[in-house]
Each structure stands twice: as structure tokens, then as C-alpha cells.
Interface confidence: low
């Protein structure tokens, strides 16, 4: 609720490139950059291969002309080019940018992957996709790590054990391990391939998880988190194949025997939804381990409108499933297509995500934000992020999302999609987000049988109302301009009954009162007014409900001439509640007690006349 | 936006003064104005910050007893008075504003005023 | 509060060259993936200018042989090639913190 779609940083790349079919938030040394794939582009550091994709570096500050550059991989430029002893390289259409990740530390390196890398040592026989990752440096510059995790030497088969892995396709970054999905290992059984940089060695899968499992794909999707301990690192692999109906399995990373084991596994519910096909691992309710999002992005109630699954973790990697989301569940949609974690975009102390829909809107895309909160994701979204409402040349907006940094600045980490079939990315900012606590002071009870005011003709039934406000939040102005409407006897209102008080200001009567307040930084500023009760109320029984409603009045966003301008900034989401506050009081009863039970005898006689 | 400050001020030991910052070309409501000393050949030190809608203060704590902060809305001026002047207070103040928000840098300076302390 | 420690304390460089200015902090001015340390240039007789903020952006109208770098607790403000009209103090600040505190000035 708290992106500012209105003010879009946009990104252009090459035409018919992909450019913004995987995306990346990056920052290093205070330099912040989006990352761009583009895994159709030609590259201009290997002229004579044909489209190998490129990754794209576009600086966010002091760029006004939003100018994106490749990042040169010192990747030679010729055809053959040796890479082992039975290893010669074919770059032509590698995808290279297909996937990108980033180490989670200050310094984090950049892992980029072209799963369609081929290895043609063997050409005669064989062509094979082993797929090629590229670790890059914090900084950005040449030179960086070669992984060709599916290479092995003297093996030429192309369906057999890792022949056509096709590694990279999804790729995740730990500070530890380098994780990448290759999903055509074993004849499309597929893998994880999984290195642990700290020594240098990948962690096995057990090949008997998956020799029997053609065609699963796992490894479509990776992610790694904390599922069974706060300080351990386990990892996740879909499989949008398995059984027609996808699954997901969670592997922990044995350093000892250096092997991955499976500790869970969920399964889709319809053929070819494509379960699994997305991932993401986040802590949603903050209590240190991470839950899990699995997307399946073409489950159909009519066409593909897409579904997400969230399980919420219990501990020991025992996670459950909470709910499915469907965003707006529009027709051939593919929600959850792409699914990233946010970090906490509204700064109320839990993680948030986006989810996204690229074919919606006929391939215009949409992407939604949910939030965390402690009982896990809170059902409803916050906000629907349109790409044609953003910019109507957007096409498939949505299939990648990057979060997690704040990119402007302003204490609020920011969001980036990418929208490939249109060659664009689009950074969008996130606002400051406002807190507004509200206060109705009334009294305990009415009396109405001693009338304290005066209402010009004659004495009246009446009680003091006050109203207090305060602000906080991070980074937000010194001073901001509230409007509030302040409704006396609102359930009556709502059910279209008059209401049984009235306010009364400089003698005019009113059901409500409108005002606008200056409100300072964590200081309360409060109102006081008096209400009368109507005469001859007859419910004297049903609570009286006071309702303050309050909305930000027009902010003043100071200098427009800045690059990135302040944002205005926003009031918290009441999750999807209306943004007010109520308080009741009761008309007093009178009793000894409050709890005011009849003591009522009724006795009954029969008179019968005679006709 | 321009911050102007009050010119050079000769004051004697034990006495007070007060330096002022007139704002102008936004809303001064919504920024807090920040002053720092420069002592003779020295570096700078930030002293505190005021919220001209609230009057709300903040200091380093060895200020905390030298130094008033008030505001005037009407002429939108920020004043610092300085108590119990010894030569240690002699150096240039001067005003200054945030960028934006509370956490950014200081993007504008009045011209600064020399106090000298001399008897 | 955090202390920032500059070095050199002064420095000559000859016209064209590089001039290096480096500040280390106490402890950590990082924040959510933001550097709250600022650079600015002081000339005689006039108040002090930003330069860089956040760590390594340009303020606009800056000219661009000034750079900044580094996270955490090590930075460095580069001028490359150094003109004349560069003969000035420079002195680094941190907000991550309060109070805020400006480094002793090159």
C-alpha cells in the first residue's frame, strides 16, 4: 500500500531482448544499482555470438537519463573455447540472465546464470546443456567465477545423469552456498546443485530421491531458508512436474556427509497447475524461521488465473499450509508466476511480499503485494500494482519482482519489476508510512435523569467528547495535516436509524464533525466537544459508538527538482479495515449493579365470555 | 531556500547573546533547523536541532545548559540564545537544514555569525 | 556517539592529480542498506558545502571528479584530477546516530 506507483523509475533495454525477465536489487559501497536479464540480448563484449543474453547494470542515483550498461563478464568471444578437458563451450542463445541472485551481506556478490549453455565437446554425438552460472564481484567488474556445476569429464550422454541439467534456470544466493536448479538431470528428473563456498565442494543430492522420477523438473524453482533451526540453512527445490501435480521438497544441508536430505514435501492439487514452479522463502510472523510460498501459476478454476500456497512453519521443518492466495483470480492470469520476498515494505516489523500476474490484463501484468503479520500473511492484499495503469507499453509486468533494499534512500526498502516482453523494468519507491494513534475519551456512562446542559430552550441530557491524535514512523515529515471526521452513534447511522446524540459547536447542531488538524512529530494534539442526547430516546440499552475516520490531507513533498524526490508519505493499512478509530459509551442504567438482570414475575389468568 | 543569519557579534565574558536564522523558500514548519559551532581553526560540532511547529528540542549534552532554541513562526526565524559567554564560546554558528525527512544530510547552511567573546 | 577519525589531516596534491580523503567511524553507520555518512567541502570565510551523500551519491550540481566510497566504518572521498579551485577543508558526518558528529577536517 506503501509503493508510490505514481513516480515509476523506468528502465529501458534492447528491443526483443527479454530485457526484465529476471531482475535484482543490488547495492555496493553505497552505489545502488538494478540488475537486469536479459537473456535474448546480444552481447557487445562477444560480438560473434549469437544472442547470448546479457546482464544490464542501471545505477539508480545520479542517472537521470536512466541509462542501463551490460556488465562485461570477460567471457572471450569465440566459439569452442575450451572449459576442462572434454569441455568445449557453445554460447549461441545461452539465456545468459535467465536467473539472477544476490548474497545477502553488505558486500553480497551476484550470481547470474544461461541455463542454455551447451557444452559441444562431444558434438558429434552429443550436444550438451549443462547450463553455466557466473559468480560477479560486489563491484561489479570483471573478473568474477565460472560454475559449470553439471560438467563432468568424459561424460557424453545427453539424458544420462548430468548431461542436459540445464543448471541455473533458478538460482539462489546464501552467504554460504551457491544454489542453482537443474532440472534435466536424470532425464528431467532433474536437481539441486548446491556449492558450499567455505570449502569449495557441492553438497549430493541422493540420486535415488530422484533416478526414478523422469520428468518432475525439480530444480524449476530454488530457494534456500531457516525451516529447521533459526541458524540453520536448508534448501528448497520445486518440482512443477512431479506427478502431473508439482511438489515441493525441503533438503537440509548435511555438512558432514556433505549431502542434502529431505526433511518435507508438499504436492500441488490440480494437474498442471505447475506447483512449485516459484518459490519463496521469508519469516513471515517473525518468530525466526522461515515460512514457505509456492506458486503454481497456472491453476485453473476456468484458465490459468494462477494460485500461491503459504505454509506457516512450526519448527523442525514441520510447516503447514495456511491458505491459498489468488489475487483477483482474473482469466489466464498466472499469479505466482514470480514471488519475492520484500523485506518489511511498511516498516511494522514484518516481512512482506510480492506476487506476481504477468499475463493479466491480456499480458499487460500486475503484481501484488501482501504483508506478514504475526498469525502468518494477511489474506487480503494491500495493494494491486497495475502495469498498464503504470505505464501502458508494460507487457508481462510481473514475471520478475526484486525487493529487500532501499534503493532512494529514505529508510523504506523499494520494489523493481520486470515487464520482458516490452524490454522494460520499472523501480517503484516506497512511501513513508504514517502511524496515527487515536483516542476517544468519553464517559463511563450517560446520565439522563439529571440533565447537564442547556440547549437555548430547555435543559438536556449531554456528555464531554474528546479527541486526541499523535503520529510516529520512520523517516516521515515533522509535521503533517490531518483530516478526521468525528461521527457520533455510528451503529445507528449504519443501519440507517437516527442517531440518539448530536454534537453542538459555537450553537449548531451536527451528527458529525469535520476538521482538519496541523499534527507535530509524537505530540498529541486533542479536541474537546459536548453532545447532546435527543429527547425521548427510546433504546436506552444499545451501546452509543463514536467513530474517528482520518485521512492525510495534501502533503507538501519539498524539492521536485531532486532526481528522487521525497515521496508523500501514507497512513498505516488497518488490513483492509477502514481507517478510524471507535470508542462507546452506555446511557446508565441506574441499578445497584452493572449487571442489571430482570426480576419480573408475571402471573396470568384466563377470562373466557360467554358468546 | 536561503537561511540568513545575524551578523558578527562582540559580546563580553558572562554575558548573553542571541543569534537568529531567518528562513525562507519552504514551509518552515516542516523541517527542523540544526545549528553547528566552528571554533577558530577548528572543525565542526553539531549543537542541537529545534521543530519550529512544536518548539521541540534536542542537544549534544554539553550544550544542553549553554544553549536556547526557540522559533517565531510568524517571521519564520529560528533564534539561539547563548548563556554565561567565555572565550570557549568564541566561533562561528551557523544554521542549518536537512535535505528531507530525519535521517538525510545537510543540504543548506546560512552564511553563518561569528560571536567573539573579548572583555 | 559515534567518532569520525579523519586522515590525512592535511594534504598537498599537485594540479591533475588524485587526492584521497579517508574517514573511519567508531562503529557501523549502516542502516538497512543505506550509509548514512556525508562529505563536505568548506572553503575560508564561508559555510560548509555537501558534497556526497549517503556515502558515494553526487549532489547535483557537483562536479564529477568528486567521488565517494566505502561501507560500514571505512570511506574515502576522492578527487580526481584535483583543480585548484579544490583548496578547501573537507570534513565527513555521519546521521546514523545521534548526536550527529562531523570527522576533525582535511
Known amino acids: 500500500y506503501n509503493l508510490d506507483p505514481q513516480r515509476p523509475v523506468h528502465f529501458q533495454g534492447p528491443a526483443d531482448s527479454f530485457f526484465g525477465y529476471a531482475v535484482l536489487e543490488h547495492f555496493h559501497d553505497n552505489t545502488r544499482w538494478v540488475l537486469v536479464g536479459a537473456p535474448k540480448a546480444d552481447s557487445k563484449y562477444s560480438p560473434s555470438v549469437k544472442s547470448p543474453g546479457a546482464v544490464f547494470k542501471c545505477r539508480v542515483h545520479t542517472n537521470p537519463d536512466r541509462r542501463c550498461t551490460e556488465l562485461d563478464m570477460a567471457r572471450g568471444k569465440n566459439r569452442g573455447t575450451s572449459c576442462g578437458k572434454t569441455c568445449r563451450e557453445d554460447r549461441d542463445d545461452e539465456w545468459m540472465g535467465v536467473s539472477l541472485a544476490r548474497q545477502p551481506k553488505a558486500d553480497g556478490r551476484v550470481l547470474a546464470c544461461a541455463h542454455r549453455w551447451k557444452n559441444i565437446y562431444y558434438e558429434a554425438d552429443h550436444i550438451l546443456p549443462h547450463g553455466f552460472c557466473y559468480i560477479i564481484p560486489s563491484n561489479l567488474q570483471a573478473k568474477g567465477r565460472t560454475l559449470i556445476p553439471c560438467y563432468e569429464e568424459y561424460k557424453k550422454k545427453y539424458g544420462e545423469e548430468h548431461g542436459s541439467c540445464q543448471a541455473g534456470i533458478a538460482g539462489f544466493f546464501t552467504e554460504e552456498l551457491v544454489v542453482m536448479g537443474a532440472p534435466g538431470s536424470f532425464y528431467w528428473a532433474g536437481t539441486i546443485k548446491v556449492l558450499n563456498l567455505t570449502d569449495n565442494t557441492y553438497l549430493k543430492l541422493n540420486d535415488e530421491v530422484i533416478m526414478n522420477r523422469r520428468y518432475t523438473y525439480l530444480g524449476y524453482a530454488v530457494t534456500a531458508g531457516h525451516f529447521s533451526h533459526p541458524s540453520t540453512i536448508d534448501v528448497v527445490g520445486g518440482a512443477p512436474q512431479d506427478k502431473g501435480i508439482g511438489k515441493v521438497y525441503i533438503f537440509r544441508a548435511d555438512r558432514r556427509s556433505g549431502t542434502l536430505i529431505k526433511i518435507f514435501q508438499a504436492s500441488g492439487k490440480k494437474m498442471g497447475s505447475y506447483f512449485g514452479s516459484s518459490l519463496c522463502a521469508v519469516d513471515l510472523n517473525g518468530d525466526g524461521l522461515s515460512d514457505l510460498l509456492v506458486g503454481a501459476p497456472m491453476f485453473s478454476e476456468i484458465r490459468d488465473e494462477g494460485q500461491v500456497t503459504v505454509y506457516i512453519n512450526r519448527g523442525n521443518g514441520a510447516l503447514e499450509e495456511q491458505l491459498a492466495l489468488t489475487g483477483d483470480g482474473a482469466y489466464n492470469a498466472h499469479f505466482g508466476e514470480s514471488i519475492a520476498s520484500l523485506d518489511d515494505l511498511d516498516n511494522d516489523g514484518f516481512p512482506d511480499v510480492a506476487i506476481g500476474a504477468p499475463k493479466e490484463d491480456d499480458f499487460a501484468g500486475a503484481v501484488y503485494i501482501y504483508h506478514g503479520d504475526a498469525g502468518g500473511i494477511v489474506p487480503q492484499y494491500s495493494m494491486k500494482l497495475s502495469g498498464q495503469k503504470i505505464n501502458p507499453v508494460l507487457r508481462m509486468f510481473g514475471q520478475s519482482i526484486s525487493g529487500g533494499i532501499d534503493m532512494d534512500g529514505n529508510g523504506y526498502p523499494d520494489v523493481t519489476v520486470g515487464a520482458f516482453m516490452s524490454d522494460s523494468v520499472v523501480l517503484l519507491r516506497a512511501r513513508p508510512v504514517i502511524t496515527v494513534d487515536v483516542s476517544i475519551f468519553l464517559p463511563g456512562s450517560i446520565n439522563i435523569t439529571a440533565p447537564q446542559c442547556h440547549d437555548g430552550q430547555q435543559p438536556v441530557n449531554c456528555l464531554n467528547v474528546t479527541t486526541c491524535f499523535s503520529f510516529h514512523g520512520k523517516h516521515v515529515p515533522g509535521e503533517i495535516g490531518l483530516n478526521y471526521v468525528l461521527m457520533a452513534d455510528v451503529a445507528k447511522k449504519e443501519k440507517g436509524q437516527m442517531p440518539r446524540v448530536y454534537f453542538v459547536l459555537l450553537g449548531e447542531t451536527m451528527g458529525q464533525v469535520t476538521e482538519k488538524l496541523q499534527l507535530t512529530y509524537m505530540e498529541e494534539t486533542c479536541r474537546h466537544y459536548v453532545a447532546h442526547v435527543k429527547r425521548r430516546v427510546q433504546d436506552v440499552i444499545s451501546p452509543i459508538v463514536f467513530e474517528a475516520a482520518y485521512s492525510l490531507s495534501e502533503h507538501v513533498t519539498g524539492e521536485e527538482e531532486r532526481e528522487l524526490p521525497p515521496l508523500t508519505p501514507v497512513l498505516r493499512w488497518k488490513k483492509g479495515q477502514k481507517i478510524a478509530q471507535k470508542n462507546q459509551t452506555v446511557f446508565e442504567r441506574n441499578c445497584r449493579s452493572e449487571d442489571c438482570a430482570a426480576d419480573l414475575q408475571l402471573q396470568g389468568k384466563l377470562l373466557l365470555s360467554s358468546m | 531556500v536561503k537561511l540568513q543569519e545575524s551578523g558578527t557579534k562582540l559580546v563580553k565574558p558572562g554575558a548573553s547573546v542571541r543569534l537568529s536564522c531567518k528562513a525562507s523558500?519552504?514551509?518552515?514548519?516542516?523541517?527542523?533547523i540544526h545549528w553547528v559551532k566552528q571554533s577558530p581553526g577548528q572543525g565542526l560540532e553539531w549543537i542541537g536541532e529545534?521543530?519550529?511547529?512544536?518548539?521541540?528540542?534536542n542537544f549534544i549534552e554539553n550544550f544542553e545548559t549553554k544553549a536556547t532554541l526557540t522559533v517565531d513562526r510568524s517571521s519564520t526565524t529560528a533564534y539561539m540564545q547563548l548563556t554565561s559567554l567565555t572565550s570557549e564560546d568564541s566561533a562561528v554558528y551557523y544554521c542549518?537544514?536537512?535535505?528531507?525527512?530525519?535521517?538525510?544530510?545537510?543540504?543548506?547552511w546560512g552564511q553563518g555569525t561569528t560571536v567573539t567573546v573579548s572583555s | 556517539q559515534i567518532v569520525l577519525t579523519q586522515s590525512p589531516a592535511s594534504l598537498a596534491v599537485s594540479l591533475g592529480q588524485r587526492a584521497t580523503i579517508s574517514c573511519r567511524a567508531s562503529e557501523t553507520v549502516d542502516s538497512y542498506g543505506n550509509t548514512f555518512m556525508h562529505w563536505y567541502q568548506q572553503k575560508p570565510g564561508q559555510p560548509p558545502k555537501l558534497l556526497i551523500y549517503l556515502a558515494s551519491n553526487l549532489e547535483s550540481g557537483v562536479p564529477v571528479r568528486f567521488s565517494g566510497s566505502g561501507s560500514r566504518t571505512d570511506f574515502t572521498l576522492t578527487i580526481d584530477p584535483v583543480e585548484a579551485d579544490d583548496a578547501a577543508t573537507y570534513y565527513c558526518?555521519?546521521?546514523?546516530?545521534?548526536?550527529?558528529?562531523f570527522g576533525g577536517g582535511t
Open positions: 542549518a537544514r536537512l535535505a528531507y525527512g530525519n535521517y538525510s544530510w545537510f543540504a543548506y
Open positions: 523558500g519552504y514551509t518552515f514548519t516542516s523541517y527542523w
Open positions: 558526518q555521519q546521521n546514523n546516530e545521534d548526536p550527529y558528529t
Open positions: 529545534i521543530n519550529p511547529s512544536s518548539g521541540r528540542t
